[in-house]
Amino acid sequence: EEELQVIQPDKSVLVAAGETATLRCTATSLIPVGPIQWFRGAGPGRELIYNQKEGHFPRVTTVSDLTKRNNMDFSIRIGNITPADAGTYYCVKFRKGSPDDVEFKSGAGTELSVRAKPSAPVVSGPAARATPQHTVSFTCESHGFSPRDITLKWFKNGNELSDFQTNVDPVGESVSYSIHSTAKVVLTREDVHSQVICEVAHVTLQGDPLRGTANLSETIRVPPTLEVTQQPVRAENQVNVTCQVRKFYPQRLQLTWLENGNVSRTETASTVTENKDGTYNWMSWLLVNVSAHRDDVKLTCQVEHDGQPAVSKSHDLKVSAHPKEQGSNTAAENTGSNERNIY
């Protein structure tokens, strides 16, 4: 009679994570008598997966009834597969011995490959806000996928970006992989409503890529422009001066009025108007009692936007003559003042 052979008909098996893997194995003879064991890997460090004779293997079930005397099918099923299960599985026939069974013959092995979906891409931007015309870096990360082949693309408002670098780790063989990509994005003044999108395509996603997004509203700071103007006289001794704060983002803004360098009033932007591009406008006014001043008054609108150093714009109010409509002009002091004008 021909010597027993252990047949593993499948050189490789590909299974999606979470599914059940079937590893087939048949023997060509009932002799010699002895159990079958399944191992992952070969050599002294191999891992026991299933032992017909003894042990508890909750994830493993046999395809046929191994208790039947004439059974020669030793195929197994492994449930709830994860990338950690990837490897080469060997079906090994043992010959009954005393005191221990002796390894008799091994199958050629079946390589189990696990297809695992990538995690949802996570996109993160710079630690602090940046202003228009600057290039900032965004990162995209996705983990736990297998096989290694993966495609990553970047978009800004639907337009594909080309300035990015991508790494898939580890470089060598692994049960699962991670992808890390860094894209450079140029901010514009119109980017408050913009989005940066990282798109990951993988064989496990069946043509439906995963996307991670970052809103540039979290990244951009659009500095305001300031304009101080004097309004027509309200009453004989009163002048209304307005400070227009335009095109700023985010909304966090505090405005201080100074009269000849002394704080007159401080307020926080609340009832702002929103522009189509997502930036804000705000106006503050100051009623100045001209009769309370002997000399010309230097009015300064000082703005602190989003925690940045304060910026200001000044207006000289002439009180020597009867107040009338005036335009903004520069200080007639001996040296530049300590306020910094935005323009």
Epitope: P126, T135, T225, R340
Partner: antibody
């Protein structure tokens, strides 16, 4: 008081790279951009680019076609400007200067670093 | 890139003279214009920013004006320490650009 202190003069061969440092003090480093401006002997001023230490955001003069790399080390309040593939026409004094992002011109300047490119 | 055309490239003047330097931008740059003074072997010094705002510590004989594309630096009464080279610069859009400079020399 606000100070920007630059590294010392350098002599480089064509094709080499140079890295100039600019150490800031006297203000909150992450609130202001650091700009780089160069001036060839007897010539005018030329803006190279800037970096915002807070966000790491950079703006570059495309004339330099990727030869300029600006980095920052917030732990030492230092900005670095590296210029690669040097040629003789890169011989110049290189200045760093600070500005409030999006608002102001350059109000404080470093003392300048002379970079000489010669074979 | 925005071109900043500065004129004249040089001028000779005497102490006490009123000096005017002009700068023309190739496109609208709003009010984002600065003026610098540079003396030989020194870094530039900011005089005016935002077209007309005097930098802290700068004497009031320096003034700036203009808007849109046309800008002017005026020294009302030239002093001995004012002989230097002056540059205009736009900071509305990158790349930031400078004028070619105006060298103010003693007549």
């Amino acid at each position: 008081q606000v100070q920007l202190v630059q590294s010392g003069a350098e002599v480089k061969k064509p094709g080499a790279s140079v890295k100039v440092s600019c150490k800031a003090s006297g203000y909150t480093f992450t609130d202001y951009e650091i700009h780089w401006v160069r001036q060839a002997p007897g010539q005018g001023l030329e803006w190279m680019g800037d970096i915002h230490p807070g966000s790491g955001g950079t703006a570059n003069n495309q004339k330099f076609k990727g030869r300029v790399t600006m980095t920052r080390d917030t732990s030492t309040s230092t900005v670095y400007m590296e210029l690669s593939s040097l040629r003789s026409e890169d011989t110049a004094v290189y200045y760093c200067a600070r500005a409030v992002s999006g608002y102001y011109a350059m109000d404080y300047w470093g003392q300048g670093t002379l970079v000489t490119v010669s074979s | 890139d925005i071109q900043m055309t500065q004129s004249p490239s040089s001028l000779s003047a005497s102490v006490g003279d009123r000096v005017t330097i002009t700068c023309k931008a190739s496109e609208d740059i709003y009010d984002r214009v600065a003026w610098y003074q540079q003396k030989p072997g020194k870094a530039p010094k900011l005089l005016i920013y935002g077209t007309a705002s005097l930098e802290t510590g700068v004497l009031s004989r320096f003034s700036g004006s203009g808007s849109g594309t046309d800008f002017t630096l005026t020294i009302s009464s030239l002093q001995a320490e004012d002989f230097a080279t002056y540059y205009c610069q736009q900071y509305w859009t990158t790349p930031w650009t400078f004028g070619g400079g105006t060298k103010v020399e003693i007549k």
